[in-house]
Interface confidence: medium
């Protein structure tokens, strides 16, 4: 019922940016289920995130990324939920269900070409990597109340008011003093009184929904998570300073104990569940380069070992407007020589914590094909091929000539439009075959094209083993075998008797056996047998055999 | 055979709310991902959210990000799709679709295999 696929493929045109984003994510659970229609599957990655380009991207300052890079992530549970082992959470995958391929054309496919760029390094977190991803959505840290602003100045000097101010940091309700004037211009200081003052929320309550980004310094290799709150808050045993917690191990959890004068007890206690280090990972080019022109292969691979729970990581991409949710991804229908950027990000317990950008070039194709001009022999021995270039890249050219079974190639200069064959046999016939080459990650041969000449005809080579034998006194056998070159279309063999220098007998068979009779004994004569192709006759073999005296 | 039955569709004042449901039924199969489409006469199948069924991750196009919710009910054998706010341009028919295998980009209808019938949802101004 879905649309059939354009056969376009994907187009590298310029495309608007892409309508998908994603929702705050839920704590990561897996339930079991009966088995149903919609079931888990057998998969490597468990939980994806979506990509979201029209949100606030994150920016890093290029001097941070000499030591440190930055990640976002949010909704830090506090409470982390058991992961509960079923079969599909099975580190191993199942054969091929780890890799994404696009293979087709969806109409609303569209990949973007990135003019001019160099590849970008695969390494997470070097300058050269471009981040396009989004920073997670921030939940609210504090409750803004809406309070409506009176004028004081408008009301009576006998009215006490009782004035209530939001303390946007705090987020609670304090009394206040209020100065008002009277319509005399006196200053009239009234006493705010209010009978309760609203109690103040628990820091569990109001670091509910806290997140935190993740700093990794590539030296130490060790991680610091800034809190994103607006108030300078309290961590028990000093595990923080300015917000920040410090010297965090990749894969262990770290309990913190968060407070602060604007709420009270219970503290909120937040589990940092630290992620790998950020330089185990490397986004791999896995493209075969048999098929680099139109395919793009890219997938993360873990370079060095970590305790993290692998399950609890997933990997999403984008490439145009297409999103991938695997650890593998696969592009197909490609055009060759073309930029194509994919942007690609790996979460922990489904908070991202580190990207990467490629910027991939696909090979040089397969060039086009030769428009073959004119092909023909206007001689016996030589050839002639004329030809305009293909339209695509190509290195040189190779020439084949086959006549039979034998083939012949040559390998010609891209700058040549025409070769004349030399030294060919004649009156056969030359099948050519003219492709295009390239050598790129391999070499790529375009398609051949093909064209045909006969050679003229020359004169054929000697007809050879030639015998003259008496059968009687004055009859003679003559034989020979073909010439080994006919070098025509036809095949006569003659045979010329000379006695002196007059030509006695002049015979003409389709092959050479030619019994000649009646010829005079005791005499000399010269026997010239040659072939004749029907444009040329050969080179005579002459023999010269007498007759005997007449027995009788 | 394999089933999907999408319910919930209707007639909805502008600003009023939706909740549309999909049941899977017949034989069992391995869904990598459900997800929402709409399409209105004349054009072409609009992908709205998708969730993935090992997980439960969730993608929304732009237009309805914030006020649709896309959830799964793994015992019920159920993906709802809850929809707030509505806006006249939501009106359309709504289809529930189904990838066994997803090999192609999940936001595209040609990556998905079984598909409902479809459920007219109308906003009125």
């Known amino acids: 019922q879905s649309p059939t696929p354009s056969p376009t493929g994907l187009t590298t045109a310029k495309m608007p940016s892409v309508p998908l984003s994603s929702d705050p994510l839920p704590t990561h659970t897996t339930a079991f289920s009966p088995a149903s229609t919609f079931e888990r599957e057998n998969d490597f990655s468990e939980t994806t995130t979506s990509l979201s380009p029209d949100n606030t991207s994150t920016q890093v300052s290029p001097d941070s990324l000499d030591n440190a890079s930055a990640f976002n992530t949010t909704g830090v549970s506090s409470v982390q939920t058991p992961h509960l082992p079923t079969h599909a959470d099975s580190q191993t995958p199942s054969a091929g269900t780890d890799t994404q391929t696009f293979s087709g054309s969806a109409a609303n496919a569209k990949l973007n070409p990135t003019p001019g760029s160099n590849a970008i390094s695969d390494v997470p977190g070097e300058r050269s990597t471009a981040s396009t991803f989004p920073t997670d959505p921030v939940s609210p840290l504090t409750t803004t109340l809406s309070l409506a602003h009176h004028s004081s100045a408008a009301l009576p000097a006998r009215t006490s008011n009782t004035t209530i101010t939001a303390n946007t940091s705090d987020a609670y309700l304090n009394a206040s003093e209020t100065t008002t004037l009277s319509p005399s211009g006196s200053a009239v200081i009234s006493t705010t009184t209010i009978a309760t003052t609203p109690s103040k929320p628990t820091c569990d309550e109001k670091y509910a929904n806290i997140t935190v980004d993740y700093l990794y310094n590539k030296e130490t290799k060790l991680f610091t998570a800034k809190l994103n709150v607006n108030e300078n808050v309290e961590c028990g045993n000093n595990t923080c300073t300015n917000n920040e917690v410090h010297n965090l191990t990749e894969c262990k959890n770290a309990s913190v104990s968060i407070s602060h004068n604007s709420c009270t007890a219970p503290d909120k206690t937040l589990i940092l569940d630290v992620p790998p280090g950020v330089e185990k990972f490397q986004l791999h080019d896995c493209t075969q380069v048999e098929k680099a022109d139109t395919t793009i292969c890219l997938k993360w691979k873990n370079i060095e070992t970590f305790t993290c729970d692998t399950q609890n990581i997933t990997y999403r991409f984008q490439c145009g407007n297409m999103i991938f949710d695997n650890k593998e991804i696969k592009l197909e229908n490609l055009e060759p020589e073309h930029e194509y950027k994919c942007d690609s990000e790996i979460l922990y317990n489904n908070h991202k914590f580190t990207n990467a950008s490629k910027i991939i070039k696909t090979d040089f194709g397969s060039p086009g094909e030769p428009q073959i001009i004119f092909c023909r022999s206007e001689a016996a021995h030589q050839g002639v091929i004329t030809w305009n270039p293909p339209q695509r890249s190509f290195h040189n050219f190779t020439l084949c000539y086959i006549k039979e079974t034998e083939k012949d190639c040559l390998n010609l200069d891209k700058n040549l439009i025409k070769y004349d064959l030399q030294n060919l046999k004649p009156y056969t016939k030359y099948v050519l075959s003219l492709h295009a080459y390239i050598i790129a990650k391999v070499q790529r041969n375009g398609s051949a094209a093909m064209c045909h000449f006969t050679t003229k005809s020359a004169p054929p080579s000697q007809v050879w083993n030639m015998t003259v034998s008496m059968t009687s006194d004055n009859s003679m056998h003559v034989k020979c075998r073909p010439p080994r070159d006919r070098n025509g279309p036809h095949e006569r063999y003659h045979l010329e008797v000379e006695a002196g220098n007059t030509l006695v007998r002049n015979e003409s068979h389709k092959n050479c056996d030619f019994r000649v009779k009646d010829l005079q004994y005791s005499t000399d004569y010269t026997f010239k047998a040659y072939f004749h192709n029907g444009d040329y006759p050969g080179e005579p073999f002459i023999l010269h055999h007498s007759t005997s005296y007449n027995s009788k | 055979e394999v089933q999907l039955v999408e319910s919930g569709g209707g007639l909805v004042e502008t600003g009023g709310s939706l909740r549309l449901s999909c049941a899977g039924s017949?034989?069992?199969?391995?869904?990598?991902?459900v997800g929402w489409f709409r399409q209105t006469p004349g054009k072409e199948r609009e992908f709205v959210a998708s969730?993935?069924?090992?997980?439960?991750?969730?993608y929304y196009a732009d237009s309805v990000k914030g006020r649709f919710t896309i959830s799964r009910d793994n015992g019920k054998n159920t993906v709802a799709l809850q929809m707030n706010n509505l806006k006249p341009e939501d009106t359309a028919v709504y289809f529930c679709?189904?990838?066994?295998?997803?090999?192609?980009?999940?936001?595209?209808?040609?990556?998905?295999?079984?598909w409902g019938q479809g459920t007219q949802v109308t906003i009125s101004s």
């Open positions: 679709a189904a990838a066994v295998r997803l090999t192609a980009p999940l936001n595209f209808d040609t990556s998905y295999d079984y």
């Open positions: 017949g034989r069992t199969f391995s869904s990598r991902h």
């Open positions: 969730i993935r069924w090992s997980g439960g991750h969730t």
